[in-house]
């Protein structure tokens, strides 16, 4: 049986909140990595200005069994307007490079970082 | 082909709580998010929400948080909103509508009228 | 909570051309935001006409067409029909939640 009662529904989190546990769950990522991350996964390079959180997603949730990335690809979900399914490439337009899962979390680190500290939540 | 089908107009009292139905049909409910959108007499439209169907994921506009519940059967690929404690600015047409990215938007519900009046 | 603004009326003559902008409080509108402009006529539904930014949904004629100019979202309406007098929505998305412009009448006259 499952109790849908009795909570009230906490407020929807501001973007300036949903892009900061975004970037803290990167740092997170980074500062733990050990082992090559997501066993050296290699995915697609995205272009950090053009729609980039359903194309990081995109490229993303291509990895599969990485439990380091599971939260970071379910808050992504959260943050692009459509569905996005493995295999999906509508916001990847240009597909012509692979990176390591590693490389990519710190390319999408530093340009989240940079969009946080000019103000820039939208 | 693609159809949304939602439930007859209302007409209630302030403090009720309205339930509207949205079922699908010809494409796999569970592919896409739905989205529900207010639009008041003669006024612009208001994003309320969306849901993944597959999961039950939503997102709220702060606006309608505390009193809007999106939900979704898979089992009757139907779609639903409650909105409560409704006031007479609810009174509106309520929209359900497909959102993907190569047609976000791209189907609605024959929207839905709902009169809240003493 | 952002406030996404566009011009309350635009006039067009027939066959001309007119810009209508979607304006983010918040500061520059970017690909991000995955910019969505809308068509609506009396007694009906939304019409989708641009999504993305700048990609024209199935079936919208080439005359439309979306950008980002100086910061803002624009639709841009190049050789006017008659069939074009409606009110237009954009819908701006705000990394978990959208937001509808206030809208544009355009009047073909």
């Known amino acids: 049986l499952t109790c849908l009662g009795g909570f009230a529904s906490p407020g929807p989190v501001p973007p300036s909140t949903a892009l900061r546990e975004l970037i803290e769950e990167l740092v997170n990522i980074t500062q733990n990595q050990k082992a090559p991350l997501c066993n050296g996964s290699m995915v697609w390079s995205i272009n950090l200005t053009a729609g980039m959180y359903c194309a990081a997603l995109e490229s993303l949730i291509n990895v599969s069994g990485c439990s380091a990335i599971e939260k970071t690809q379910r808050m992504l979900s959260g943050f692009c307007p459509h569905k996005v399914s493995a295999g999906q490439f509508s916001s990847l337009h240009v597909r012509d490079t692979k990176i390591e899962v590693a490389q990519f979390v710190k390319d999408l680190l530093l340009h989240l970082k940079k969009l946080f500290r000019e103000g820039q939540f939208n | 082909e693609v159809q949304l089908v939602q439930s007859g107009a209302e007409v209630l009292k302030p403090g009720a709580t309205v339930l509207i139905s949205c079922k699908v049909s010809?494409?796999?409910?569970?592919?896409?998010?739905m989205h529900w959108v207010q639009q008041a007499p003669g006024k612009g439209l208001e994003w309320m929400g969306r849901?993944?169907?597959?999961?039950?994921?939503?997102k709220y506009a702060p606006k309608f948080h505390d009193r809007v519940t999106i939900t979704a059967d898979t089992s009757t690929d139907t779609a639903y909103m409650e909105l409560s404690s409704l006031r007479s600015e609810d009174t509106a047409v309520y929209y359900c509508?497909?959102?993907?990215?190569?047609?976000?938007?791209?189907?609605w519900g024959q929207g839905t009228l709902v009169t809240v009046s003493s | 909570q952002a406030v996404v603004t566009q011009e309350p009326s635009l006039t067009v003559s027939p066959g001309g051309t007119v810009t209508l902008t979607c304006r983010s409080s918040?500061?520059?509108?970017?690909?991000?935001?995955?910019a969505n402009w809308f068509q609506q006529k009396p007694g009906q539904a939304p019409r989708t006409l641009i999504y993305g930014t700048n990609n024209r949904a199935p079936g919208v004629p080439a005359r439309f067409s979306g950008s980002l100019l100086g910061g803002k979202a624009a639709l841009t309406l190049s050789g006017a029909q008659p069939e074009d007098e409606a009110e237009y929505y954009c819908a701006l998305w705000y990394i978990n939640h959208f937001i509808f412009g206030t809208g544009t009448k355009v009047t073909v006259l």
């Open positions: 849901i993944d169907p597959e999961d039950g994921e939503t």
């Open positions: 010809g494409y796999t409910f569970t592919d896409y998010y």
């Open positions: 509508t497909r959102y993907d990215y190569y047609g976000p938007f791209a189907y």
């Open positions: 918040t500061g520059a509108v970017t690909t991000s935001n995955y």
